[in-house]
């Protein structure tokens, strides 16, 4: 159960939205190379009516897997702000999230030639970037939905 705090939007607009926008701004060029395929995460986790808290809780958890993936400290700092800030504002209690180490972002690849490995690594990096951008966009949309009280009825 999540008792969403700060529904007036002050904390969201002054901290979270600033960081989300900074992150999205730094990822402006990502998108044109992204495949059209739907990521499994978004098939399963939707910012649906009455499930906004659940979506944001899992999205914030997923964001943590991207920490240290990007070389710049600023990027990581903003990611951390969005992840931690979302979790704090959600104020979720009694979450039955089974103890488990975070799943690796990419699947392990069989041994391949150096050239193939380089290509696979580049594709995986692009895939992760596409996913992260989409995740941030959906987190922003979901927060806006909560704060504006817009219900898709």
């Amino acid at each position: 159960d999540c008792d969403i705090e700060g529904k007036d939007g002050k904390q969201y607009e002054s901290v979270l939205m600033v960081s989300i926008d900074q992150l999205l701004d730094s990822m402006k060029e990502i998108g044109s190379n992204c495949l059209n395929n739907e990521f499994n995460f978004f098939k399963r986790h939707l910012c649906d009516d009455n499930k906004e808290g659940m979506f944001l809780f899992r999205a914030a958890r997923k964001l943590r897997q991207f920490l240290k993936m990007n070389s710049t400290g600023d990027f990581d700092l903003h990611l951390l702000k969005v992840s931690e800030g979302t979790t704090i504002l959600l104020n979720c209690t009694g979450k039955k999230v089974k103890g488990r180490k975070p799943a690796a972002l990419g699947e392990p690849q069989p041994t391949k030639s150096l050239e193939e490995n380089k290509s696979l690594k580049e594709q995986k990096k692009l895939n992760d970037s596409c996913f992260l951008k989409r995740l941030l966009q959906k987190i922003k949309t979901c927060w806006n939905k909560i704060l504006m009280g817009t219900k898709e009825h």
Epitope: N36, E38, F42, D48, A103
Partner: antibody, heavy 117, light 111 residues
Framework: QVQLVESGGGVVQPGRSLRLSCAAS????????VHWVRQAPGKGLEWLAA???????DYNSAFSSRFTISRDNSKNTLYLQMNSLRAEDTAVYYC???????????WGQGTLVTVSS | DIQMTQSPSSLSASVGDRVTITCKAS??????????INWYQQKPGKAPKLLIY???NVEFGVPARFSGSGSGTDFTLTISSLQPEDFATYYC?????????FGGGTKVEIK
């Protein structure tokens, strides 16, 4: 409120084709994945296919060679093109809106397809 | 494909009874700390209705007497106190791996 209405069912001869439609209302159709699920008379449920917001598709491999899912967001409509129909395709065909956990959160009333000579 | 084995296939119960339906998957339905199993109720001539999603989450508007539990391959749908409107067929469905698959159903009849 969310509403899904299937149409296009009826009696068809084996080997022929049929296109089912599902008209959606009461929600932003383009923002959700949608599925086709069928149920043969007196039998259980069988997932056929899904189409996602960006247009990518997932199929049950048992049907991917004969069935094609598509959507027209401008018309808020989902389609299922069924080719080379067989007697065993006789069933009620439901469209369903994707829900949390890739569940089927909302269902249409279903449309009956009877394949018979 | 993941096989979903539901038991029993049918049961007779009285109003007020506690009813338990089980579903066993041929492989684990757990991923990232969540269980990808959903439960539905279907009445004759009607479309199925979502009751429980992701193992234990009760769908909005569904009475609190319905609950879901389990992890890995073994899952349970419980109706704490059966009501007259609960006589129906119940299905489990896994969404961990494509193709999405359903259990064979459990028909709950009046004793």
């Amino acid at each position: 409120q969310v509403q899904l209405v299937e149409s296009g069912g009826g009696v068809v001869q084996p080997g022929r084709s049929l296109r089912l439609s599902c008209a959606a209302s009461g929600f932003t159709f383009s923002s959700y994945g949608v599925h086709w699920v069928r149920q043969a008379p007196g039998k259980g449920l069988e997932w056929l296919a899904a189409i996602w917001t960006g247009g990518s598709t997932d199929y049950n491999s048992a049907f991917s060679s004969r069935f094609t899912i598509s959507r027209d967001n401008s018309k808020n409509t989902l389609y299922l093109q069924m080719n080379s129909l067989r007697a065993e395709d006789t069933a009620v065909y439901y469209c369903a809106r994707n829900g949390y956990g890739e569940s089927f959160a909302y269902w249409g009333q279903g449309t009956l397809v009877t394949v018979s000579s | 494909d993941i096989q979903m084995t539901q038991s029993p296939s049918s049961l007779s119960a009285s109003v007020g009874d506690r009813v338990t339906i089980t579903c066993k998957a041929s492989e684990s339905l757990d991923h990232d700390g969540d269980s990808y199993i959903n439960w539905y109720q279907q009445k004759p001539g009607k479309a199925p209705k979502l009751l429980i999603y992701m193992g234990s989450n009760v769908e909005f508007g569904v009475p609190a007497r319905f609950s879901g539990s389990g992890s890995g391959t073994d899952f349970t749908l419980t109706i704490s106190s059966l009501q007259p409107e609960d006589f129906a067929t119940y299905y489990c469905q896994q969404s961990n791996v494509d193709p999405l698959t359903f259990g064979g159903g459990t028909k709950v009849e009046i004793k």
